[in-house]
Interface confidence: low
Amino acid sequence: SAPFSFLSNVKYNFMRIIKYEFILNDALNQSIIRANDQYLTAAALHNLDEAVKFDMGAYKSSKDDAKITVILRISKTQLYVTAQDEDQPVLLKEMPEIPKTITGSETNLLFFWETHGTKNYFTSVAHPNLFIATKQDYWVCLAGGPPSITDFQILENQA
């Protein structure tokens, strides 16, 4: 995966929250849920009230990148999805407010959001070859592809 220094000269400025309180379901129709205060996992739910609700904030790149760069926050909290390394769980990082500017190693808070039909992919800005992924009997993690599941459906207005 790409080292942090590769992107260290790119600055990302917060624009606005573009989605509120949505749910992420993977290709097996499993919803992302809180495993504990640090990690996320995926489970098939009867009741979507148990699923994590996310907010998505958009950032503008100083590189004028065509990709949509986003931050993922658990709704109504100060917890932000943070990438680690390949096959490592994504972490929930607590911050007092949404970062106004992100650069260097802090890009592990950012993801490129790509859509293909109803499929949504979140590629780590810090590790551009790795995606947010679900994996059987494991936390939500960063992965390059199968056997991990990297495509998600966004469910909105589930309240």
Epitope: R34, N36, V52, K53, K76, T77, L79, A159
Partner: antibody, heavy 118, light 107 residues
Framework: EVQLQQSGAELVKPGASVKLSCTAS????????MHWLKQRPEQGLEWIGR????????KYDPRFLGKATITADTSSNTAYLQLSSLTSEDTAVYYC???????????WGQGTTLTVSS | DIVMTQSQRFMSTSVGDRVSVTCKAS??????IAWYQQKPGQSPRALIY???YRYSGVPDRFTGSGSGTDFTLTISNVQSVDLAEYFC?????????FGGGTKLEIK
């Protein structure tokens, strides 16, 4: 410092309705969820429901559907609980509480005692 | 609904002792459990969330443990100020439900 200030004790007659209030300071209720809970002597705590003040969406324990209505006024930073067709079973202390994204309650109001008696 | 059972309605202990309050869920709730303390005439106070995380300001003599269906709140070096009722609560599924409470008496 976060504080939830509830309205004062109420003595009402059976069949009547009552509206309890919970005014928050130190937090914007639009940024959180507000819950209402019921406590009767020696009966533990019962969750009535919650509201997302940002959009007015409320959820209830099915047992309180038709009995309780939760609303919020973001301009006054206040959540409300209206109880209708009151009976002696509604005599209790009612608490408002702030729920985080996981629905445990980190801040509680001081409670409002409701007495239903003729 | 998920039923939360606190089998001991009353527990008696002495200052300096260690006491464990238990709570059982009728189905798997992971670690989505909170514990509250309610002193006589007061509102409940949050002690523990996510089964084992203490709220800020809560003394470290309060410890939460467990996952799945069985949970424990342990109070070590019990103090007279711990005279209170203790409730568990699950937040895995609606409706949110509480245990019936355990009253801690100080000998």
């Amino acid at each position: 410092e976060v504080q939830l200030q509830q309205s004062g004790a109420e003595l009402v007659k059976p069949g009547a309705s009552v509206k309890l209030s919970c005014t928050a300071s130190g937090l914007n209720i639009k940024d959180t969820y507000m819950h209402w809970l019921k406590q009767r002597p020696e009966q533990g705590l019962e969750w009535i429901g919650r509201i997302d003040p940002a959009n007015g969406n409320a959820k209830y324990d099915p047992r309180f559907l038709g009995k309780a209505t939760i609303t919020a006024d973001t301009s006054s930073n206040t959540a409300y609980l209206q109880l209708s067709s009151l009976t002696s079973e509604d005599t209790a202390v009612y608490y408002c509480a702030r729920g985080d994204g996981n629905f445990h309650f980190d801040y509680w109001g001081q409670g409002t005692t409701l007495t239903v008696s003729s | 609904d998920i039923v939360m059972t606190q089998s001991q309605r009353f527990m008696s202990t002495s200052v300096g002792d260690r006491v464990s309050v238990t709570c059982k869920a009728s189905q798997n709730v992971g670690t989505n459990i909170a514990w509250y303390q309610q002193k006589p005439g007061q509102s409940p106070r949050a002690l523990i969330y996510s089964a084992s995380y203490r709220y800020s300001g809560v003394p470290d003599r309060f410890t939460g443990s467990g996952s799945g269906t069985d949970f424990t709140l342990t109070i070590s070096n019990v103090q007279s100020v711990d005279l209170a009722e203790y409730f568990c609560q699950q937040y895995t599924r609606y409706p949110l439900t509480f245990g019936g409470g355990t009253k801690l008496e100080i000998k």
